[in-house]
Interface confidence: low
């Protein structure tokens, strides 16, 4: 079951998924000037058996027409239900060091992939929050959010992390403001 909405936004914080539950989909997005090959899958799917999880399908991008006007591949309507944008940074991913039953690691990059990764999370997925650079944790509650199914609807649990800068008033829970532009979580996925 796909999660219906995005993980919560926390002021001055970003989230990352360090491993992806089976059933997670990753759109095969290509950078400008490239498109998904016609015979290629529109997404990768985390699948597995009792002992091993891995990504089915491979994303492949090919050069667009000579005029180079093709935009990035647009997900099909069914793919747009849950769009998760994450920054691709380096290949030194935290997920590469994590092994969790029933979860896939961060898929390796593919040639000419887009700079953002769009994930479709499933119920049971956990994402972890960190304060962006220059901000500190003021309140130290659980710093993760889990997509749960409640009364037939999906919802993300509310993380209890509050990040504050030393020179500004403290933010209080529920006070939302435009997210700070982060450097990004240390070599991992970053919310947009």
């Amino acid at each position: 079951e796909l999660c219906d909405d995005d993980p919560p936004k926390i002021t001055h914080a970003t989230f990352k998924a360090v491993a992806y539950k089976e059933g997670t989909m990753l759109n095969c997005e290509c950078k400008r000037g490239f498109r998904r090959i016609k015979s290629g899958s529109p997404y990768m799917l985390c699948t597995g058996n009792s002992s091993h999880s891995s990504w089915d399908n491979q994303c492949q991008c090919t050069s667009s027409a000579a005029r180079n006007t093709t935009k990035q591949v647009t997900p099909q309507p069914e793919e747009q239900k849950e769009r998760k944008t994450t920054e691709m940074q380096s290949q030194m991913q935290l997920a590469d060091q994590v092994s969790l039953p029933g979860h896939c690691r961060e898929p390796p990059p593919w040639e000419n992939e887009a700079t953002e990764r769009i994930y479709h999370f499933v119920v049971g997925q956990t994402v972890y929050y960190q304060c962006v650079q220059g901000y500190r944790a003021l309140h130290r509650g659980p710093a993760e959010s889990v997509c749960k199914m409640t009364h037939g609807k999906t919802r993300w649990t509310q993380p209890q992390l509050i990040c504050t800068g030393e020179t500004e008033p403290s933010q209080f829970p529920g006070e939302e403001e435009p997210q700070a532009s982060p450097d990004g979580l240390p070599e991992s996925e970053t919310s947009r």
Epitope: V18, M92, Q93, R140, P142, E144, D183, P186
Partner: antibody, heavy 117, light 107 residues
């Protein structure tokens, strides 16, 4: 007041096992990102393992498959189970709290592990 | 892995001196850098995070600067309690790595 107190270190033969404990007070271990960092005269400070609040764990290449990080929420305690110990694992082991930005804002006093025959 | 190199490895100074310790990262880490102070037989203590932000409770004579690959820890006027070993740490990418340390000794 935040406090971390390690125990369980000692002298062990190569191939042996030890379990280190880190008792926390002043905050809840299960809600935080916790780490074990070791220090040797030769290699300096090295992040050995960490555990995220949701249970995700990670290990340095040098200990993966031999060490296991865990916690007991009811005791508010962090553990490091060390198996198949080698001479190069000899170090002072610290538990440390991550401040949610990969900086370590509180450390225990450390416990010495000596692996020698 | 990102290597962190500190210089000098040791430095001698007197009370009241201004001391500068440098740390270089093998690749750019923006300002994902911390400085720690460690005294013999004690655990490291966080002084500076995010390259230049002072940890709560740390005296203002400590300051940090730099971005990218080159960073500096400055103690504006050395006090007797500042003689210790100082470490830098990058928090940009896993595995998190530390510098080899700079020992600050009394001249």
């Amino acid at each position: 007041e935040v406090q971390l107190v390690e125990s369980g270190g000692g002298l062990v033969q190569p191939g042996g096992s030890l379990r280190l404990s880190c008792a926390a007070s002043g905050f809840t271990v299960s809600s935080n990102y916790m780490s074990w960092v070791r220090q040797t005269p030769g290699k300096g400070l090295e992040l050995v393992s960490f555990i995220y609040s949701g249970g995700i764990t990670s290990y340095a290449d040098s200990v993966r498959g031999r060490f296991t990080i865990s916690r007991d929420n009811s005791k508010n305690t962090l553990y490091l189970q060390m198996n198949s110990l080698r001479a190069e694992d000899t170090a002072v082991y610290y538990c440390a709290r991550d401040d949610y930005s990969n900086y370590f804002d509180y450390w225990g006093q450390g416990t010495l592990v000596t692996v020698s025959s | 892995d990102i290597q962190m190199t500190q210089s000098p490895s040791s430095v001698s100074a007197s009370v009241g001196d201004r001391v500068t310790i440098t740390c270089r990262a093998s690749q750019g880490i923006s300002n994902w850098l911390a400085w720690y102070q460690q005294k013999p037989g004690k655990a490291p203590k966080l002084l500076i995070f995010a390259a230049s932000s002072l940890q709560s409770g740390v005296p203002s004579r400590f300051s940090g600067s730099g971005s990218g690959t080159d960073f500096t820890l400055t103690i504006s006027s050395l006090q007797p309690e500042d003689f210790a070993t100082y470490y830098c740490q990058q928090a940009k990418s896993f595995p998190i790595t530390f510098g080899q340390g700079t020992r600050l000794e009394i001249k």
